[in-house]
């Protein structure tokens, strides 16, 4: 060994290097919460990237730059390294445009806590070996949502839309020039029936066991769905997110009161299978699996 | 294919009567705001005459008022207009809407959906 390298493996096995790099990182973090930092920040900046250049080359020069087997790009954690002072260096000397996006990348700075602190090491460990482990569950759990998103578009499609509408009109009016024209949430509220503090209009459906409406409205299939348009089974991909919604409880009850709403009760069988398979196994499934691979990473 | 039957118009004179009347061939219609008969006189615009909603209320032009009377057999799914009194400005071709929801049979469709029209002339 050269003795540069002697010096440098010295340098990297001592725990005030450690120390030091923390606590830079952890200063860099503070710095970069600042929301208008003074002018001097910048000097500040340059000493964390001389400071971040600094650990790199002794880890270099101490166990060899890619070409062996325990060598500096060897490490994953040494890649977060490499990218953070590459893109100091790019955003500070190279002009590149739209810098703010580039910017962006200081914060995998904080990210270097990660492979300084021994028990967070653990941990990102056990969950990116938990995320190879949930390639299995997450595939189980996509064909299992793409078949109830599939079953729900059957069943469901379009009924989102049905609204109850007033049984006044004036006399040049008829439900599709209505339809053409309507625009604002006030056009909405003076042809369709709202329930107090609602921002929806009242759902209804077209069976006997659905939603029916009040006296002096009518059900029809006119305008967007409710809340903005975003809950619907009206193509694949909404429908979907509906299942996702469903699997993860995301005020799923409000999604199962409107499709039961517009559908009918009959339809809380599919809700029923769907919260028992998609909410209680398939999440315990991906949990067991994350618990698993957190427990082999200890060992 | 929607499907609305009028019948009923012809020849009378001023002061005669004659009696609509608007089917809806196909089970398909689900549920009506209202049914309605519109007219489009020669080189006028369709106008409405009278309609008639769901829940039974009803609404007429004020040129036909007290002479038309509209009415329904939801049982038939079929909707009349008795014309009484009727002036040769009554003269046009009389058109049935369905303004509502019908079944495609894969999904429920709302809107207007009108028939081929009756010719009404009144001349002596």
């Known amino acids: 060994f050269s003795p540069l390298r002697r010096i440098s493996i010295k340098i990297l096995v001592h725990s005030l290097f450690s120390m030091l790099i923390m606590c830079t990182i952890l200063t860099n973090c503070i710095f970069m919460t600042m929301n208008n930092p003074p002018d001097w920040t910048k000097n500040v900046e340059y000493t964390f990237t001389g400071i971040y250049t600094f650990e790199s080359l002794v880890k270099i020069l101490a166990r060899g730059f890619c070409v062996g087997e325990f060598t500096f790009l060897r490490d994953p954690w040494n890649w977060l390294d490499f990218v953070v002072i590459v893109f100091a260096y790019l955003t500070e000397f190279v002009n590149l445009g739209n810098v703010s996006a580039l910017r962006t990348f200081r914060v995998l700075r904080a990210l270097k806590t990660i492979s300084v602190i021994p028990g967070l090491k653990t941990i990102v460990g056990a969950l990116i070996q938990s995320v190879k482990k949930l390639s299995d569950v997450m595939i189980l759990t996509v064909f299992c949502l793409s078949v109830f998103a599939l079953i729900g578009l059957q069943l469901f499609m379009g009924n989102l839309k049905h609204k109850c509408f007033r049984n006044s009109l004036e006399n040049n009016e008829t439900l599709e020039s209505i339809m053409n024209t309507l625009e604002s949430e006030e056009d909405f509220r003076k042809y369709f029936y709202y329930l107090e503090g609602s921002k929806d209009a009242l759902l209804c459906g077209f069976s006997t066991d659905s939603g029916q409406c009040p006296e002096g409205y009518t059900c029809v299939k006119i305008g967007r769905n409710p809340d903005y348009g975003y809950t619907s089974f009206d193509t694949f991909s909404w429908a979907f997110l509906a299942l996702f919604r469903l699997m993860t409880q995301d005020y799923w009850e409000n999604l199962y009161q409107q499709t039961l709403r517009a559908a009918g009760k009959t339809y809380m069988i599919f809700f029923v299978v769907v919260i028992f398979l998609g909410s209680f196994y398939l999440i315990n499934l991906i949990l067991a699996v994350v618990a698993m691979a957190y427990e082999e990473q200890n060992q | 294919e929607v499907q609305l039957v009028e019948s009923g118009g012809g020849v009378v004179q001023p002061g005669g009567s004659l009696r609509l009347s608007c089917a809806a061939s196909?089970?398909?219609?689900?549920?009506?705001?209202?049914t309605g008969w519109y007219r489009r006189a020669p080189g006028k615009q369709r106008e409405l005459v009278a309609r008639i909603y769901n829940e039974g209320n009803t609404q007429y032009a004020d040129s036909v008022k007290g002479r038309f009377t509209i009415s329904r057999d939801n049982a038939k799914k079929t909707v009349y207009l008795q014309m009484n009194s009727l002036r040769p400005e009554d003269t046009a071709l009389y058109y049935c809407?369905?303004?509502?929801?019908?079944?495609?049979?894969?999904?429920?469709?709302?809107?207007?959906?009108w028939g081929q029209g009756t010719l009404v002339t009144v001349s002596s």
């Open positions: 809407l369905f303004s509502g929801t019908i079944s495609t049979g894969r999904e429920y469709r709302s809107g207007d959906y």
């Open positions: 196909h089970r398909q219609f689900i549920r009506d705001v209202f």
